[in-house]
């Protein structure tokens, strides 16, 4: 069986719809891909971070639709029967099973685009996604294994004397807490049902001459520091500054 | 629930004209395509042709001179006519359904007799 | 168009036996199987849709497997009332072939 070479150099496109929302896709120039496109004789599985309530376009292979006979999309989502949705050229038909969720949809008539969208990712649409072609000359594979990524909510206080508390909120996947300058610190971490995870770092610094310190948060949606004065009077609070 | 049911003549002469009736109930043509299929005594099961839930007509590359495929959505009904019979178009008669998940057929006809004898 | 050969023509096996089947298309038909069970006197009946899928109220001692080109058909545990003919049939286009029956 054959499959569609990814493109490694491949960029995320970003691009901004009317409706506001972010939009990304693995979509490939399409005469990049159909030259590199019967060189390979594996499936294409690619691990796909995507932002939740952006828009993501999957792609299937690049076959000319002429050479099409079937095209399938499988999506397995956790906790769910396996959705297909097909289209058949010769009676230009679609059938799909299982299929709940109105925002997975093809981008238009599959007679013209057989690409597959999601309307505003949500925390659900982690998974599995699967074109299947069938051409005269065998079936060709792309896979997703998409991930949805979610910001995680950052805050940072003092609770006690020269001890800081910083918090990454349910986050997608989990977050990392470093703080500058290095202290006494215990990380922890709370999983929820949904998936996300809410990490807790609590800081303690001995040294009198550390007056100012700084939670950085990294994250694959983006990093972000806080920076916390410390009060030497016990019990006091301070919220944090953004860097 | 589902149902579909052929009706026809049981009985045709050599070189007459076959039509047959595909009379469906519990869904509609426009939702789902139908097939009718062939097996001569003893045989195997042979595709004769379909009309797809757009009303698209398909036909078995052997037998297109002799056939036409139809239907009356208002009515539900699918119609075949094959000219020309033979001794050899004797066989069951089916209609099936395609599938609503794929292209399968998921609910078939009991199947008419049809025998070509003079 | 699609030739699909089935094998074996005929099997002698007895209750609670493992039975396997095979179909194989002439050319690449993805995973566009269905195999149907046909009883004497009856009208055939859907088993397997696209090659490994279990139809509806189908038990599970039926099973289907394959893609491309080669497709194989198991009963496990063989009961009484599985005596029947058994079809393979390619549904990727037109016209559809089916096997000669097991």
């Known amino acids: 069986e054959g499959a569609a070479q990814p493109n490694n150099s491949l960029m995320l496109q970003t691009s901004k719809e009317n409706h506001a929302l972010a939009s990304s896709s693995l979509c490939m120039d399409e005469k990049q891909i159909t030259q590199n496109y019967s060189k390979v004789l594996a499936e294409v599985n690619t691990s796909w971070p995507v932002k939740m309530a952006t828009n993501a376009v999957l792609c299937c292979p690049p076959i000319a639709l002429r050479n099409l006979i079937i095209i399938t999309w499988e999506i397995i989502l956790r906790g769910q029967p396996s959705c297909t949705k097909a289209y058949k050229k010769e009676t230009n038909e679609t059938k799909e099973t299982n299929c709940t969720d109105e925002r997975i949809t093809w981008v238009s008539r599959p007679d013209q685009n057989s690409d597959l969208q999601i309307r505003t990712v949500a925390i659900t649409h982690d998974g599995y996604y699967r074109c299947i072609m069938v051409t005269p000359d065998g079936n060709f594979h792309r896979g997703y294994h998409l991930q949805v990524l979610v910001t995680p909510e950052v805050t940072l206080f003092q609770n006690r004397n020269r001890t800081a508390v910083c918090k990454a909120v349910a986050g997608k996947p989990a977050a990392h807490i470093s703080w500058i300058p290095e202290g006494d610190c215990a990380t922890k971490q709370e999983y929820w049902s949904n998936g996300t995870v809410t990490v807790k770092s609590t800081c303690h610094w001995e040294v009198h001459n550390v007056s100012t310190v700084t939670c950085h948060v990294s994250h694959l949606t983006g990093n972000k520091s806080l920076y916390i004065e410390l009060l030497p009077v016990p019990g006091a609070k301070k919220s944090a500054k953004l860097y | 629930q589902v149902q579909l049911k052929e009706s026809g003549p049981g009985l045709v002469q050599p070189s007459q004209t076959l039509s047959l009736t595909c009379t469906v109930s519990?869904?509609?043509?426009?939702?789902?395509?139908v097939s009718w299929v062939r097996q001569p005594p003893g045989k195997g099961l042979e595709w004769i042709a379909a009309i797809s839930s757009g009303g698209g007509t398909f036909y078995n590359s052997a037998l297109k001179s002799r056939l036409s495929i139809s239907r009356d959505t208002s009515k539900s009904q699918v119609f075949l006519k094959m000219n020309s019979l033979q001794t050899e178009d004797t066989a069951i008669y089916f209609c099936?359904?395609?599938?609503?998940?794929?292209?399968?057929?998921?609910?078939w006809g009991p199947g008419t007799m049809v025998t070509v004898s003079s | 168009d699609i030739v699909m050969t089935q094998s074996p023509t005929f099997m002698s096996i007895s209750v609670g036996d493992r039975v396997t089947m095979s179909c194989k298309a002439s050319q690449n038909v993805g995973s566009n199987v269905d195999w149907y069970q046909q009883k004497t006197g009856q009208s055939p009946k859907l088993l397997i849709y696209?090659?490994?899928n279990r139809y509806t109220g189908v038990p599970d001692r039926f099973t289907g497997s394959g893609s491309g080109t080669g497709f194989t058909f198991t009963i496990t545990n063989l009961q009484a009332e599985d005596l029947a003919v058994y079809y393979c049939m390619q549904s990727l286009s037109f016209p559809y072939t089916s096997g000669a029956g097991t």
């Open positions: 099936a359904r395609d599938g609503d998940w794929d292209w399968y057929f998921d609910f």
């Open positions: 696209k090659a490994s």
């Open positions: 519990g869904f509609s043509l426009t939702n789902n395509g």
